[in-house]
């Protein structure tokens, strides 16, 4: 048993039929010695008396908020949550496996630049009685600070018969060094509590591997005289690290016909302009990627040819 | 050329060669994103590599103030990786494919380090840890880890030279 936060405890249980469970001793937080009784949740039925209460915790029916009282006055509470381990593996019932970029990916994170700011998100089908708490650090043995905000519900989607809820959190490395080569990964730890079930999820990454620039901005077309060619120009996204002479992007320019089956013409360039042939009813799209490290491409910025 | 005395390197040449190094490092190990090598244990094998750290002066301000600290750090790393790529880790079994970019990568590392430090001038270099994996699978894993680490290192070096070429060239 360990303390998650004040008055909230997690009991780790090997989860199999007829498992013996864990013996837990609760102590009433009071200088009083006599006349103490214990109850569970909203029930008034006395489970035991004395400064300590010993319980055998085997299943969710044994978890809940234990309260010690004296003479009708509440002295203290202890909320017991369960963390299940089945076949040596901690349960992952609360979050959905996103399966990208690989199986057992419950947390996904992205950064728009090298500032040390990043966003993580996760999915669940659970709509109520759900709380999340996020902690992060750079490295684990001698951790350096990363500050995370509160996790918030960021999207709701309908997937078949189910509703899916997306939660996200923003974190910022306290002393980020954008130009350095990372040697210790960022660790992100999410505590999830659904009713009386506790689970934790972790992710470990370098900022450089989760970089995904915003799409290029101010995408414009300038027709060239007496030609089907156009000059496409764009700018670095506002959110990208500066100076751009140091934090450089490379770009992919694509001409795409109305039909998805039509052949796509693609040009790669380090410049912020390119000359392409603009076909009727086609659109021109541009996306960006770190020039020197192959992390994710941005989403496309697009304009119609007409 | 960067010499210990403090004259400027051939920024544009260094920029071109470092960008080529980035391309080669990724073509040598393109599937890096699909393999979380940090889960594979054996961490001590690659945590001795020289990293370009916060105090090494490789940020835009540090380069403007005095690029020598950063260039020396980059040179150290280039020599380190050049030796690793020429070692038994890459020359032993399983053999690299004949068209593997590792050979080109090795030569380019040497080329860039020579651009930074001509013959007769010596910057301090870092000791190469004695890594001699016994099993072919260990060697393969170590190659991936080294290449992954090299990708991060050359990305920072390429940024330094690109910025130098744009802002510090005479």
């Amino acid at each position: 048993i360990w303390e998650l936060k004040k008055d909230v405890y997690v009991v780790e249980l090997d989860w199999y039929p007829d498992a013996p469970g864990e013996m837990v001793v609760l102590t009433c937080d009071t200088p009083e010695e006599d006349g103490i009784t214990w109850t569970l949740d909203q029930s008034s039925e006395v489970l035991g008396s004395g400064k300590t209460l010993t319980i055998q915790v085997k299943e969710f029916g044994d978890a809940g908020q234990y309260t010690c009282h004296k003479g009708g006055e509440v002295l203290s509470h202890s909320l017991l949550l369960l963390h299940k381990k089945e076949d040596g593996i901690w349960s992952t019932d609360i979050l959905k496996d996103q399966k990208e970029p690989k199986n057992k990916t419950f947390l996904r994170c992205e950064a728009k630049n090298y500032s040390g700011r990043f966003t993580c998100w996760w999915l669940t089908t659970i709509s109520t009685d759900l709380t999340f708490s996020v902690k992060s650090s750079r490295g684990s043995s001698d951790p350096q600070g990363v500050t995370c905000g509160a996790a918030t519900l960021s999207a709701e989607r309908v997937r078949g018969d189910n509703k899916e809820y997306e939660y996200s959190v923003e974190c910022q490395e306290d002393s980020a060094c954008p130009a350095a080569e990372e040697s210790l990964p960022i660790e992100v730890m999410v505590d999830a509590v659904h009713k009386l079930k506790y689970e934790n999820y972790t992710s470990s990454f370098f900022i450089r591997d989760i970089i995904k620039p915003d799409p290029p901005k101010n995408l414009q077309l300038k027709p060239l005289k007496n030609s089907r060619q156009v000059e496409v120009s764009w700018e670095y996204p506002d959110t990208w690290s500066t100076p751009h002479s140091y934090f450089s992007l490379t770009f992919c320019v694509q001409v795409q016909g109305k039909s998805k089956r039509e052949k796509k013409d693609r040009v790669f360039t380090d410049k912020t302009s390119a000359t392409v042939i603009c076909r009727k009813n086609a659109s021109i799209s541009v996306r960006a990627q770190d020039r020197y490290y192959s992390s994710s491409w941005s989403e496309w910025a697009s304009v119609p040819c007409s | 050329r960067a010499v210990p005395g403090g004259s400027s390197p051939a920024w544009t040449q260094c920029q071109q060669l470092s960008q080529k190094l980035c391309t080669l490092a990724w073509s040598a190990h393109p599937l890096v994103g699909h393999m979380d090598l940090r889960e594979e244990g054996d961490e001590e094998t690659t945590n001795d590599v020289p990293h370009i750290q916060c105090g090494d002066g490789c940020d835009p301000q540090g380069l403007r103030d005095n690029s020598q600290f950063c260039l020396q750090r980059i040179h150290q790393g280039l020599i380190f990786y050049e030796k690793l790529l020429g070692s038994d880790i890459f020359t032993g079994e399983p053999s690299l494919l004949p068209d593997s970019p590792v050979g080109q990568l090795h030569a380019s590392l040497l080329g860039l380090s020579q651009l930074l430090q001509p013959e007769g001038h010596h910057w301090e270099t870092q000791q190469i840890p004695s890594l001699s994996p016994s099993q072919p699978w260990q060697r393969l894993l170590l190659r991936f880890k080294i290449l992954r680490s090299l990708q991060a290192f050359v990305a920072v070096a390429a940024r330094v030279f690109a910025h130098g070429a744009a802002t510090l060239s005479p």
Epitope: E45, G48, K195 | -
Partner: nanobody
Framework: EVQLVESGGELVQAGGSLRLSCAAS????????MAWYRQAPGKQRERVAT???????DYADSAKDRFTISRDNAKNTVSLQMNNLKPEDTAVYYC????????????????WGQGTQVTVSS
């Protein structure tokens, strides 16, 4: 809908024995403590015995050495074996259980049965 139904109450001679049973039914997620209470005419309701989820019993002084509480978690039942009954044991005996239901599946609330009459004649 959750129901607690007591049975086994009847008229019995002093010194005799009786076994009360209580069955909880309906949408029940889990049961914590189960207990027997009694109320004699013109008196306050008083606790007789409690048994925790883990099977630990606790008795009121009046029930010690004569009464035995037991439960079957699989069947959601609780029993009270009463021996050496006395006229002062005459009362309506109520079953009480702390239940979690689907609507309150992580909070125990108290539920009561309707009671069963036990009369001990001298």
């Amino acid at each position: 809908e959750v129901q607690l139904v007591e049975s086994g109450g009847e008229l019995v001679q002093a010194g005799g024995s009786l076994r009360l049973s209580c069955a909880a039914s309906g949408s029940i997620v889990s049961i914590s403590a189960m207990a027997w209470y009694r109320q004699a005419p013109g008196k306050q309701r008083e606790r007789v015995a409690t048994i925790t989820r883990g099977g630990t019993p606790d008795y009121a002084d009046s029930a010690k050495d004569r009464f035995t509480i037991s439960r079957d978690n699989a069947k959601n039942t609780v029993s009270l074996q009463m021996n050496n009954l006395k006229p002062e044991d005459t009362a309506v005996y109520y079953c009480k259980a702390a239940l979690r239901t689907p609507t309150h599946d992580y909070n125990y609330y108290d539920y009561w049965g309707q009671g069963t009459q036990v009369t001990v004649s001298s």
